[in-house]
């Protein structure tokens, strides 16, 4: 017998499905990495789950104490009524620490975006075509920022006049998609948190 | 302050060898990916071979079988022993993170010449 397949309704907390799509995009192209470039070192085994968001956001250290505490008492009662133009908060009465933990999955998904667009830039330039970002990808972290839309300022492409190094741009694809990927989990189980509460 | 400093560059023939040793900052070297990069006389700045915190290894084609990277996690070092030199192999030898790397050292000159 066929299990029901569970499809979000329109009703349902906006972020949750972007964060799944994330999940799943982020896992089908580490994967692809990992059989594409087979000769580099691209399984967890063989590097370091190195976070370019170390000392510049505190997803973990902000979204933890969402789960750890049920009880909205647990957060000082400091509830403010934060509104955003985006649909994952909008007229939602949002406690502060919600705020700051959306906020700062926000900074680290415009961080990964930046890092991930010059990467492909220089990926597309590379006389082997190897290997490519999944356009999916950049379009469901770029669907999940805008949910949350937060109006910080954009930051520009990091533009390079150097000649790209390739085999340093893949090296470095295959550890930021192993530290993306660790960064969707936590994403998605705080909107699975969230949409549950 | 100084963050990354490297050391033993120097005249080899072809066929020498030299060691690279690269001191650096514990803030910078724990946990990470360190990497040795160098730079050919009006080339660009290419990364030559890395080395995970765990020891996994990895090197660019023109040097694999010739050099061999190493770390030693309780000193902050990281270093680069260079077999088998070629004339090619001359320029100036830096190390750093392979990802959001520090500032630059001054890095150490290596030429390879008869």
């Known amino acids: 017998r066929n299990l029901p397949v569970a499809t979000p309704d329109p009703g349902m907390f906006p972020c949750l499905h972007h964060s799944q799509n994330l999940l799943r995009a982020v896992s089908n192209m580490l994967q692809k990495a990992r059989q594409t470039l087979e000769f580099y070192p691209c399984t967890s085994e063989e590097i370091d789950h190195e976070d370019i968001t170390k000392d510049k956001t505190s997803t973990v250290e902000a979204c933890l104490p969402l789960e750890l505490t049920k009880n909205e008492s647990c957060l000082n009662s400091r509830e403010t009524s934060f509104i955003t133009n985006g649909s994952c908060l909008a007229s939602r009465k949002t406690s502060f620490m919600m705020a700051l933990c959306l906020s700062s999955i926000y900074e680290d998904l415009k961080m990964y975006q930046v890092e991930f667009k010059t990467m492909n830039a220089k990926l597309l330039m590379d006389p082997k075509r190897q290997i490519f970002l999944d356009q999916n990808m950049l379009a469901v972290i770029d669907e999940l920022m805008q949910a949350l839309n937060f109006n910080s300022e954009t930051v520009p492409q990091k533009s390079s006049l150097e000649e790209p190094d390739f085999y340093k741009t893949k090296i470095k694809l295959c550890i930021l998609l192993h530290a993306f990927r660790i960064r969707a989990v936590t994403i998605d189980r705080v909107m699975s948190y969230l949409n549950a509460s | 302050e100084v963050q990354l400093v490297e050391s033993g560059g120097g005249f080899a023939q072809p066929g020498g060898s030299l060691r690279l040793s690269c001191a650096a900052s514990?803030?910078?070297?724990?946990?990470?990916?360190m990497a040795w990069y160098r730079q050919a006389p009006g080339k660009e700045r290419e990364l030559v071979t890395s080395?995970?915190?765990?020891?996994?290894?990895n090197y660019a084609d023109s040097v694999k079988g010739r050099f061999t990277i190493s770390r030693e996690n309780a000193k902050s070092t990281v270093y680069l022993q260079m077999d088998s030199l070629k004339p090619e192999d001359t320029g100036v030898y830096y190390c750093?993170?392979?990802?959001?790397?520090?500032?630059w050292g001054q890095g150490t000159q290596v030429t390879v010449s008869s």
């Open positions: 750093n993170r392979l990802i959001n790397e520090a500032s």
């Open positions: 514990a803030s910078i070297f724990s946990g990470y990916t």
């Open positions: 080395i995970s915190h765990r020891g996994g290894t």
